[in-house]
C-alpha cells in the first residue's frame, strides 16, 4: 500500500471527510479526470488539482496533528506527479506564487504575452503540429 | 500575423509594458517554458500560465478600451490550448474556481484525495507506465 | 432576438463557383463562431465549415477542404461560403448556424440558432 | 473514423419511452459535448438537448440526454411519447481537431 493512503485516511478523519454525505453534489476532481484519457489533457487538469492541493495543505502547515500526514502526501505527489524532479517542482511552485494583483508581475505578464502564445499549441516549436491544431487564416 | 499579436501590442501601451525595464529581474513565465520540452511537463506549466492570464483578464473585464483585445486573446488563447473544445474549457474553469477556503470544498478534496493520487502518475491507470515512472517500495 | 438568414442558393452548373452569404442580428457577430452546415435532399445533416469570431481561423471537412473558402465581415454581421468546383453531390440545403462565444466560458449552447437555409442546385 | 453511430429508426406507441443511442467509433464520448437535434419533416433542426445533457428553455422534461462511458456512447431518451415527438434525430459532437460531426439520424414514428 502506498504510503499517501494511511495519512489521507488520517486527513479524513481530521476534516471529518469519510461520511458519505461529502459526496454529494457531485465530486470535484474525480468526475472531471474521468472525461479525459489523453496525456497532455490530464496534465492541464491535474496540475490545476494538484496547486489546489498544495495551497489546502499550505493553510494547515501550523496544525501540528496533521503535520506528518501532510508532509508525507507533498512528498509523494513530487514523486508521482513532478517524477521527483525539484526543478520542475519549483518551476511550477513560481508559477502558482505569482500575484495578479501585483503591477509588476501584470507588467511582465503583458510583456511575455506573445511568445506564451505562440507556444500554446502542441508542438508549434517543432512545426510537428498534429492535425487538430490546424489553423486557417484568411 | 496571428490576431492576437495586434490585441497584445494594444495591452502592452495600455499596461505600459513596452518598456525594456520591464524584462528586469527575470521573465515570469518565458524562462520556465524554456525548461521544459515534453508535452506533457509543458502542459503542466502552461496550465498555470493560461489560468493566470484568465484572472488577470478577469480583473480587467469592464475596462471598455481593452474589452475587444481581451476577447480576442482569450478566443485565441481557447483555439490554442483548449483546441476550442468547450468541454476541456468549462472543466478547467471548473477547477480553477474552487475555493480552498470553503469547508465543503475541502472536506471533497480530502475526500477526493486517495483517488486522485492514485491517478497522479502517468499511464498509472493503464498499466503502461513508462521507466520514470516505476516506483519501488520495501 | 437571435436571427441568421442565409442567401445566395441557386442553380448553377457543375464545375462552376457560388458564393452564398448568411446575415445575423439580434447578438454581438464579432464574439461568436459561425458553422456552415449541409442537408442534402433526403439525407443527414453534414459538417462544412466553421470561421472563429474576432481571431477568424477557418476549420473545413476534410471531404471538402480546397474547394470551399468561409471568410466573415464583423463590421457588417455577415459571413460568406465560397464554393469552387462544384458537383451534384454538393446539392443541398446550405445552413447558416451560431457557434459558441469562445471569449466567454459562459456562452449559450454550439448550434443553438439556426437559419432557414439557401438551396444550392448543381446540374447540368 | 470519428463516426457517431445510430439507429436508422425507432417506432413506439404514444405514452411510452423511447432511447436512442449515439455510439462514438474513435475517441472518448466524455471528452467533447454532445448535442441531440430534432428535426420535423421541412423543418430546420431544433437543440433539444445540449452538453450532454442539458436542455434548452422551451424543451419538456419528458426529453433527457446521457452519456455512458462503458459503452463510449450518448442517449436521447423521450418519455411519454407524444404524435408531435414524430422527427428525425441527430446526435451531434466533435472530432479530434474539434470539428462538428454529426450522427445519421434516427427517424422515430410514434404508433397509431
Known amino acids: 500500500q502506498d504510503p499517501y493512503v494511511k495519512e489521507a485516511e488520517n486527513l479524513k478523519k481530521y476534516f471529518n471527510a469519510g461520511h458519505s454525505d461529502v459526496a454529494d453534489n457531485g465530486t470535484l476532481f474525480l468526475g472531471i479526470l474521468k472525461n479525459w484519457k489523453e496525456e497532455s489533457d490530464r496534465k492541464i487538469m491535474q496540475s490545476q488539482i494538484v496547486s489546489f492541493y498544495f495551497k489546502l495543505f499550505k493553510n494547515f502547515k501550523d496544525d501540528q496533528s496533521i503535520q506528518k500526514s501532510v508532509e508525507t502526501i507533498k512528498e509523494d505527489m513530487n514523486v508521482k506527479f513532478f517524477n521527483s524532479n525539484k526543478k520542475k517542482r519549483d518551476d511550477f511552485e513560481k508559477l502558482t506564487n505569482y500575484s495578479v494583483t501585483d503591477l509588476n508581475v501584470q507588467r511582465k505578464a503583458i510583456h511575455e504575452l506573445i511568445q506564451v502564445m505562440a507556444e500554446l499549441s502542441p508542438a508549434a516549436k517543432t512545426g510537428k503540429r498534429k492535425r487538430s491544431q490546424m489553423l486557417f487564416r484568411g | 500575423q496571428d490576431p492576437y499579436v495586434k490585441e497584445a501590442e494594444n495591452l502592452k501601451k495600455y499596461f505600459n509594458a513596452g518598456h525594456s525595464d520591464v524584462a528586469d529581474n527575470g521573465t515570469l513565465f518565458l524562462g520556465i517554458l524554456k525548461n521544459w520540452k515534453e508535452e506533457s511537463d509543458r502542459k503542466i506549466m502552461q496550465s498555470q500560465i493560461v489560468s493566470f492570464y484568465f484572472k488577470l483578464f478577469k480583473n480587467f473585464k469592464d475596462d471598455q478600451s481593452i474589452q475587444k483585445s481581451v476577447e480576442t486573446i482569450k478566443e485565441d488563447m481557447n483555439v490554442k490550448f483548449f483546441n476550442s473544445n468547450k468541454k476541456k474549457r468549462d472543466d478547467f474553469e471548473k477547477l480553477t474556481n474552487y475555493s480552498v477556503t470553503d469547508l465543503n470544498v475541502q472536506r471533497k478534496a480530502i475526500h477526493e484525495l486517495i483517488q486522485v493520487m492514485a491517478e497522479l502518475s502517468p499511464a498509472a491507470k493503464t498499466g503502461k507506465r513508462k521507466r520514470s515512472q516505476m516506483l519501488f517500495r520495501g | 432576438e437571435v436571427q441568421l438568414v442565409e442567401s445566395g442558393g441557386g442553380l448553377v452548373k457543375p464545375g462552376d463557383s457560388l458564393t452564398v452569404s448568411c446575415v445575423a442580428s439580434?447578438?454581438?457577430?464579432?464574439?461568436?463562431?459561425i458553422h456552415w452546415v449541409r442537408q442534402a435532399p433526403g439525407k443527414g445533416l453534414e459538417w462544412v465549415a466553421t470561421?472563429?469570431?474576432?481571431?477568424?481561423?477557418?476549420f473545413y471537412s476534410d471531404s471538402l477542404r480546397g474547394r470551399f473558402t468561409v471568410s466573415r465581415d464583423n463590421a457588417n454581421n455577415s459571413v460568406y461560403l465560397h464554393m469552387s468546383s462544384l458537383r451534384g453531390e454538393d446539392t443541398a440545403l446550405y445552413y447558416c448556424?451560431?457557434?459558441?462565444?469562445?471569449?466567454?466560458?459562459?456562452?449559450?449552447?454550439?448550434?443553438?440558432?439556426w437559419g432557414r437555409g439557401t438551396l444550392v442546385t448543381v446540374s447540368s | 473514423n470519428f463516426m457517431l453511430t445510430q439507429p436508422h429508426s425507432v417506432s413506439e406507441s404514444p405514452g411510452k419511452t423511447i432511447t436512442i443511442s449515439c455510439t462514438r467509433g474513435?475517441?472518448?464520448?466524455?471528452?467533447?459535448?454532445v448535442q441531440w437535434y430534432q428535426q420535423r419533416p421541412g423543418g430546420v433542426p431544433k437543440i433539444v438537448v445540449f452538453?450532454?445533457?442539458?436542455?434548452p428553455s422551451g424543451v419538456p422534461d419528458r426529453i433527457s440526454g446521457s452519456i455512458d462511458t462503458s459503452t463510449n456512447s450518448a442517449s436521447l431518451t423521450i418519455s411519454g411519447l407524444q404524435t408531435e415527438d414524430e422527427a428525425d434525430y441527430y446526435c451531434q459532437s466533435y472530432d479530434d481537431a474539434n470539428h462538428v460531426i454529426f450522427g445519421g439520424g434516427t427517424k422515430l414514428t410514434v404508433l397509431g
Open positions: 439580434g447578438f454581438t457577430f464579432s464574439n461568436y463562431f
Open positions: 452538453e450532454d445533457t442539458q436542455r
Open positions: 448556424v451560431r457557434g459558441y462565444d469562445h471569449s466567454d466560458s459562459n456562452s449559450a449552447a454550439d448550434l443553438l440558432h
Open positions: 470561421i472563429s469570431g474576432r481571431t477568424k481561423y477557418m
Open positions: 474513435r475517441g472518448y464520448i466524455a471528452s467533447y459535448y
